[in-house]
């Protein structure tokens, strides 16, 4: 399956649009960073096209419920915020026509499963970052700073997989 | 490879203004902050300040705020700090330095080669 | 602003040597510490951050140990290229500060 040109267009969006939820000054949040554990690993060039892409589904799943709690909806601006889903829910689409032509169709490999747990295991410890923080405004802005770093190097993955091909 | 590349060396007179750079390269330079450290001659490091280049926002130090000004211009990839008036006492070894922001990641892992600056009548 | 203190200002040891550079936080800065070496009329280089983790391409003589207030860079064994001059700096607040330096010298 071939991800249309426009999916990694619709990422480079996606990128823009966090930039520009920033509402605060980052210089003050400073105290506030916070070691998620990405799971740099489980998007590790190692893997086969069949294996990566419901793993990067998972990723952008998870980015779209953060982003869709009612918190969420209190700390970023709401056109912005529509704008992002939007974006969001086009990946989703795209990755989603990938699987339904049959890549990732045949028995779903371990190694899969478990790069799949991590990720939502990573969306947990950022859920509850988020919580002890009593969401607040610095705890959102490190949260959208990770969330940049680590889709933009899924974002990577996917480029690197194209030029793959 | 990541890279941050300064300005030459200067010499100036008292009073006059100037204006050194750092480029970066090798890396998305929006994404990381580019801070400022001065190294007087026989003396330890000093933080001046430091940009975000996304949006230009800046923080200093105390020491440092109102005698000079950090810019950045992200569409060449670059980074300034600039006098007005310099003084003898300017004098001094300037680094840049990029920093990874809010991410968990090191800080100031990539520096410049640094510039030499040397006020003097 | 948060002060760095640290010490010893220099010392001398031996090539082979165990050298312990330890730096004080004004207020507590949880792990936000990083440990810079520099030659002289060379930048300064990062060796450690977040107090204990060792930079890609560091030796692993090198450590970092603390928290709090109280942090330490150890070399386990010095070789010759490590003769210079040691800095911590917090990452937990602006200002950013470091410390005054710790100049490690040949006996």
């Known amino acids: 399956c071939d991800l249309p040109q426009t999916h990694s267009l619709g990422s480079r969006r996606t990128l823009m649009l966090l930039a520009q939820m920033r509402r605060i000054s980052l210089f003050s949040c400073l105290k506030d960073r916070h070691d998620f554990g990405f799971p740099q690993e489980e998007f590790g060039n190692q893997f086969q096209k069949a294996e990566t892409i419901p793993v990067l589904h998972e990723m952008i799943q998870q980015i779209f419920n953060l982003f869709s709690t009612k918190d969420s909806s209190a700390a970023w601006d709401e056109t912005l915020l529509d704008k992002f889903y939007t974006e969001l829910y086009q990946q989703l689409n795209d990755l989603e026509a990938c699987v339904i032509q049959g890549v990732g169709v045949t028995e779903t490999p371990l190694m899969k499963e478990d790069s799949i747990l991590a990720v939502r295991k990573y969306f947990q410890r950022i859920t509850l970052y988020l919580k002890e923080k009593k969401y607040s405004p610095c705890a959102w802005e490190v949260v959208r700073a990770e969330i940049m770093r680590s889709f933009s190097l899924s974002t990577n993955l996917q480029e690197s997989l194209r030029s793959k091909e | 490879e990541v890279q941050l590349v300064q300005s030459g060396a200067e010499v100036k007179k008292p009073g006059e203004s100037l204006k050194i750079s750092c480029k970066g390269s090798?890396?998305?330079?929006?994404?990381?902050?580019i801070g400022w450290v001065r190294q007087m001659p026989g003396k330890g490091l000093e933080w001046m300040g430091i940009?975000?280049?996304?949006?230009?926002?800046?923080a200093y130090s105390p020491s440092f705020q109102g005698q000079v000004t950090i810019s950045a211009d992200k569409s060449i990839s670059t980074a300034y700090l600039q006098w007005s008036s310099l003084k003898a006492s300017d004098t001094a070894m300037y680094y840049c330095?990029?920093?990874?922001?809010?991410?968990?990641?090191?800080?100031?892992?990539?520096w410049g080669q640094g510039t030499l600056v040397t006020v003097s009548s | 602003d948060i002060q760095m203190t640290q010490s010893p200002s220099s010392l001398s040891a031996s090539v082979g040597d165990r050298v312990t550079i330890t730096c004080r936080a004004s207020?507590?800065?949880?792990?936000?510490l990083n440990w810079y070496q520099q030659k002289p009329g060379k930048a300064p280089k990062l060796l450690i951050y977040?107090?204990?983790s060792l930079q890609s391409g560091v030796p692993s003589r090198f450590s970092g140990s603390g928290s709090g207030t109280d942090f330490t860079l150890t070399i386990s064994s010095l070789q010759p290229e490590d003769f210079a001059t040691y800095y911590c700096?917090?990452?937990?607040?602006?200002?950013?500060?470091f410390g005054q330096g710790t100049k490690v010298e040949i006996k």
């Open positions: 330095a990029r920093h990874p922001g809010l991410n968990w990641a090191p800080d100031f892992d990539y």
């Open positions: 090798g890396y998305s330079f929006t994404s990381y902050w």
């Open positions: 940009i975000d280049p996304s949006d230009s926002d800046t």
């Open positions: 207020q507590s800065i949880d792990g936000s």
């Open positions: 977040f107090a204990s």
């Open positions: 700096q917090q990452s937990y607040d602006f200002p950013l500060t």
